[in-house]
Interface confidence: low
């Protein structure tokens, strides 16, 4: 339905508060280096303009597209050339090339200072002094660091952030009330950002068909009682929402997401019995709740899949008539029967089925050719099952920190060219799969573990894409979305790697390590471990363990010393010499 003024339409649909918040998110995700005050000024100008269009949709410029309006506004930033370099060239382009140009310059790893949390009293004072600015600052800081954060979901985070301060700044023990809530929001926010990044990568790098396949599988697992036509409708709508958000169309995205939540709740009887509680919540909570809702129970007495997809004489006829629809039905039927499989496994099975039909439907006797197709699934199912079993056993034996270290060594040997901070970040996140998923019963382990690993490996892929250094990473990241994890799992030690020259500076530590949190201290040690492996890729587990144990003892000793700095200087030299000897450097 065409509107005379798109900006007026969205302003009316979303309301002023959400409109302003979403425009701020959009601008911060595009111009990640701009100061907060500059963005607030731009947002206020856009909002005032939108209000004139609401009053009179025929007013000058009100008929322009949102990309044109927003792009024109971003291109008024005076320091664009010196702050962003070649991104300023985007402003010479016309829409929609200009918007695509801005999208291509989004930086997954912007050079921004780490967010340091002020004292609780300082935060509470700032919150009380100017609540609106305080919350806008939160949106701005998250959006600029996470340029693909799912905008309507960020509004939900901001609502929880506000609620935490409203409650805790009145509490007797403000810190005890507030800090755990902020920690939870930070961790959930990072997870939410990474999950959305995978959705955008899926759409942008592998196309809409890949995303739709993922959505069919996931929604069929979640809503196994819904019929195929219903799942297809939800997939189409969900694809539109994520295409918009990933494309920077945040107002349309938030509006369409609200419409989708409304539709789901109005039709929950034909979708899922688990939606009742979600649908009683306010909009932001409702959308979040639906996105996280547990799988509905599988219908009783589902017939065998083989009847329609192997035994039927019409398989090739049905496939030829509407390939994607038939494959979609296969994926739907398989996924609703297998909540115990990861989405990526289901997609591998569907791909195998598609490849088999492509080959067999051209054969002399198609039925004879594809009769054993389900037998080809067995090794595909067993591979992740065995991998998860082995890794959960290792996790239970080592605990999270040492399990992360095992993965650090494993991945540094596979792709030693990758930067140390990236290897540490990715391996730490890979290692979290243990505490996240190994506690689950068998039936929930694979969807938890393998789909989580897909999210983490996508982080590696997007960070590596910015500065590609390893052909092996590029190959695993670009060849197949669903086979990324098996591709990385299959990598052996990179025999072509020339070990990094030893640099004592890398292993020089100071007394500041003693005041770090346990997490920060772990990261320091894990950074040293990666560097060790880069110097000595053929080092054995035992050698590395010995050096790391010495290192832990060294830090503990010097942090207890009276003159810490002298201890770090003197003992550090001894440690470096001993480590070199132990590793034969």
């Amino acid at each position: 339905d065409a509107h005379k003024s798109e900006v007026a339409h969205r302003f009316k649909d979303l309301g002023e508060e959400n409109f302003k918040a979403l425009v701020l998110i959009a601008f911060a995700q595009y111009l990640q280096q701009c100061p907060f005050e500059d963005h607030v000024k731009l947002v206020n100008e856009v909002t005032e303009f939108a209000k004139t269009c609401v009053a009179d949709e025929s007013a000058e410029n009100c008929d322009k597209s949102l990309h044109t309006l927003f792009g024109d506004k971003l291109c008024t930033v005076a320091t664009l050339r010196e702050t962003y370099g070649e991104m300023a060239d985007c402003c010479a382009k016309q829409e929609p090339e200009r918007n695509e140009c801005f999208l291509q310059h989004k930086d997954d790893n912007p050079n921004l200072p780490r967010l340091v949390r002020p004292e609780v009293d300082v935060m509470c004072t700032a919150f009380h002094d100017n609540e609106e600015t305080f919350l806008k600052k939160y949106l701005y800081e998250i959006a600029r660091r996470h340029p693909y954060f799912y905008a309507p979901e960020l509004l939900f985070f901001a609502k929880r952030y506000k609620a935490a301060f409203t409650e805790c700044c009145q509490a007797a023990d403000k810190a005890a009330c507030l800090l755990p809530k902020l920690d939870e929001l930070r961790d959930e926010g990072k997870a939410s950002s990474a999950k959305q990044r995978l959705k955008c990568a899926s759409l942008q790098k592998f196309g809409e068909r890949a995303f739709k396949a993922w959505a069919v599988a996931r929604l069929s697992q979640r809503f196994p009682k819904a019929e195929f036509a219903e799942v297809s409708k939800l997939v189409t709508d969900l694809t539109k929402v994520h295409t918009e958000c990933c494309h920077g169309d945040l107002l349309e995205c938030a509006d369409d997401r609200a419409d989708l939540a409304k539709y789901i709740c109005e039709n929950q009887d034909s979708i899922s019995s688990k939606l009742k509680e979600c649908c009683e919540k306010p909009l932001l909570e409702k959308s979040h709740c639906i996105a996280e809702v547990e799988n509905d129970e599988m219908p009783a007495d589902l017939p065998s899949l083989a009847a329609d997809f192997v035994e039927s004489k019409d398989v090739c006829k049905n496939y030829a008539e509407a390939k994607d629809v038939f494959l979609g039905m296969f994926l739907y039927e398989y996924a609703r029967r297998h909540p115990d499989y990861s989405v990526v496994l289901l997609l591998r099975l569907a791909k195998t089925y598609e490849t088999t039909l492509e080959k067999c439907c051209a054969a002399a006797d198609p039925h004879e050719c594809y009769a054993k197709v389900f037998d080809e699934f067995k090794p595909l199912v067993e591979e992740p099952q065995n991998l998860i079993k082995q890794n959960c056993e290792l996790f239970e034996q080592l605990g999270e920190y040492k399990f992360q270290n095992a993965l650090l060594v494993r991945y540094t040997k596979k792709v030693p060219q990758v930067s140390t901070p990236t290897l540490v970040e990715v391996s730490r996140n890979l290692g979290k799969v243990g505490s996240k998923c190994c506690k689950h019963p068998e039936a929930k382990r694979m969807p938890c573990a393998e789909d989580y690993l897909s999210v983490v490996l996508n982080q590696l892929c997007v960070l590596h894409e910015k500065t590609p250094v390893s052909d092996r990473v590029t190959k695993c990241c670009t060849e197949s979305l669903v086979n990324r994890r098996p591709c990385f799992s299959a990598l052996e030690v990179d025999e072509t790697y020339v070990p990094k020259e030893f640099n004592a500076e890398t292993f020089t530590f100071h007394a500041d390590i003693c005041t770090l949190s346990e997490k920060e201290r772990q990261i320091k040690k894990q950074t040293a471990l990666v560097e060790l492996v880069k110097h000595k890729p053929k080092a054995t587990k035992e050698q590395l363990k010995a050096v790391m144990d010495d290192f832990a003892a060294f830090v503990e000793k010097c942090c207890k010393a009276d003159d810490k700095e002298t201890c770090f200087a003197e003992e550090g030299k001894k440690l470096v010499a001993a480590s070199q000897a132990a590793l034969g450097l």
Epitope: P96, N99, E208, T243, K323
Partner: nanobody, 123 residues
Framework: EVQLVESGGGVVQPGGSLRLSCAAS????????MGWFRQAPGKERERVVS????????YYADSVKGRFTISRDNSKNTVYLQMNSLRPEDTATYYC????????????????WGQGTLVTVSS
Amino acid sequence: EVQLVESGGGVVQPGGSLRLSCAASGLTFSSYAMGWFRQAPGKERERVVSISRGGGYTYYADSVKGRFTISRDNSKNTVYLQMNSLRPEDTATYYCAAARYWATGSEYEFDYWGQGTLVTVSS
């Protein structure tokens, strides 16, 4: 009313070149991904190439990679298909199609279709 009109088809010798054009009207051209599909006599319609609404992303079928190039001119509401090193197996009716959202997808994801233009590669 939305119209997609293909032109530029014809008879060409193996190894030769052709440039197909598709002029769109009745839609906001820059809001649509565009694609070319083809159908040889007695065969399924197959996806050849598609391009995103701003031209930033393209998809090519393996059979045409390195030989065919898709481009678009949003100011002229036109999408082009430059076909080089043509082979007899490229003989088909070529259809232009428009999709509201960028897809590398199948024909089901395209909303509007042209009538087609015939390309014959023969010596």
